[in-house]
Structures are given as C-alpha cells and as structure tokens.
C-alpha cells in the first residue's frame, strides 16, 4: 500500500470518518505510520 | 480558521541562499505534515518536500540534489524551506501547503512567495 | 520519477458545456491522483483527492475517476467561475509530481 505522508493522511481521514470521529486523539498523520492500517 | 501565511518576496544573487517561512495557525501544527512545491513562470507545479513536523523526518525532490532544506519551529508553529546555490532557474513561487483533518478536511495553502534570482 | 501527462494542455469552451480532461500516469499509481485548480497570481486549490473524492466545498460539477494510469476530470456544466488552468498530481510515489496543466478558456 502507498505509505507517502499524503496517502497515509487520507487513509486516516478515512479511517476516522468510518469511526465516526471516535478514533483517540493522538491518532493524527504525523503519529501514524503506513503499518498501522 | 486554518491560515498559512508566508514570508514576502525575496529578491537572490546568483549563488546565494533563500529561507522562506511559512507561519500556519487554526490547528494543531505538529498533527500534519508540511509540503513545499514551487513554480516557475509559465511553469507547471514541481514538489520539492515535506516534514513531519511532530518528528523532523522530511522526504525531499532529489531533482535538487541536496541544495533544499526544510525545517519547522515547533514552538512557534512555523515551517521553513531553504533553498541553496540559487540560479536564474529558481526564480519561481514557492507554496507551503498542508492536508488538515481537524477542524476541516481540506487541503490548505499558503498565498506564495516569489523569490527572484538575478544577478 | 513518475510522469503526468495531461490533455489536451489548452482547449475553448462555453458557459454550460460539459469539460473533460484527462491525466496518464507513466506507471500504475492506484487511485493515488489529486486534481488542482489555480488562477492567474493565485495558489492553487484543490478539488479532488484519490481520484474520485471532492473535497467540502467543491461544486458537485467537477467531479474525477480513474485509477492504475488513467484519469479523468469532469466539470459537468462549466461556469464563468471555472476559466482556470487545472493541474493533476500524483502521491503515491516520492517525488510527488504534477501533470503539465490544462488551460481552460472562454470560447
């Protein structure tokens, strides 16, 4: 999967969409690496 | 509301060096990474890097084998590209520009700066 | 690096008609694509991101598909507002890297 800073950033922005905003804090793009998806 | 606002124009000899910043306020600074592209008159745009603010790593455009450099200061929510051995090629706009999540999806840019490099 | 290449790079068109430019990727970058719009002394501003996804805000006459290497972006009903040169770029690989442009002009 593409782990560029701009694709990691929509994938969380997908993610937390999905979990209705409900995903902690501290899970921001710059926090999360590609692995965590 | 998310604003980036960067430093005025520059005007560079041949040779010199060139540090535009990029001052971002409206959300949390360190949570999304920091892009710099550039474009040069009648040009399309050209990527140059980008930082994660929250750590330093940064990923660079090797088209400019070494001479960018982009840092950020944390404290006082700014980022910064500094460009190296400026040539007339150079002359261009360069743009911060960052894809937020909260408070707004949307991906925000800075007005530009216009660096002109003439001898 | 990935290349982007955009046609046709200008075309004529009237208020009301149905605009569509395209972007072929020199290798397979998914849906990886964003789609920009700037104008004259402006930054650019984005429509659309992975391909398909307009970002709030953004009119729902512009809209984009495509993935692997062909893309495509669509302004169903082009408005006096919508005269602007439209950029797509690439994310999926470092360098990130942008089509040449596609100058729309009043005909």
């Known amino acids: 999967a593409c782990d560029t800073a701009t694709c990691v950033t929509h994938r969380l922005a997908g993610l937390l969409s999905r979990s209705g905003g409900v995903v902690k804090n501290n899970f921001v793009p710059t926090n999360v690496g590609s692995k965590a998806f | 509301e998310v604003q980036l606002v960067q430093s005025g124009a520059e005007v560079k000899k041949p040779g010199a060096s060139v540090k535009v910043s990029c001052k971002a306020s409206g959300y949390t600074f360190t949570d999304y990474y920091m892009n710099w592209v550039r474009q040069a008159p009648g040009q399309r745009l050209e990527w140059m890097g980008d930082i994660n603010p929250n750590s330093g790593g940064t990923n660079y455009n090797q088209k400019f084998k070494g001479r960018v450099t982009i840092t950020v200061d944390k404290s006082a929510s700014t980022a910064y590209m500094e460009l190296s051995s400026l040539r007339s090629e150079d002359t261009a706009v360069y743009y911060c520009?960052?894809?937020?999540?909260?408070?707004?999806?949307?991906?925000?840019w800075g007005q530009g700066t216009t660096v002109t490099v003439s001898s | 690096d990935i290349q982007m290449t955009q046609s046709p790079s200008s075309l004529s068109a009237s208020v009301g008609d149905r605009v569509t430019i395209t972007c072929k990727a020199s290798q397979n970058v998914d849906t990886n694509v964003a789609w920009f719009q700037q104008k004259p002394g402006k930054a650019p501003k984005s429509l659309i991101y992975s391909a398909s996804y307009r970002y709030s805000g953004v009119p729902s006459r512009f809209s984009g598909s495509g993935s692997g290497t062909d893309f495509t972006l669509t302004i169903s009903s082009l408005q006096p507002e919508d005269f602007a040169t439209y950029y797509c770029q690439q994310y999926n690989n470092y360098p990130y890297t942008f089509g040449g442009g596609t100058k729309v002009e009043i005909k």
């Open positions: 520009a960052s894809i937020i999540i909260v408070p707004n999806y949307f991906d925000y």
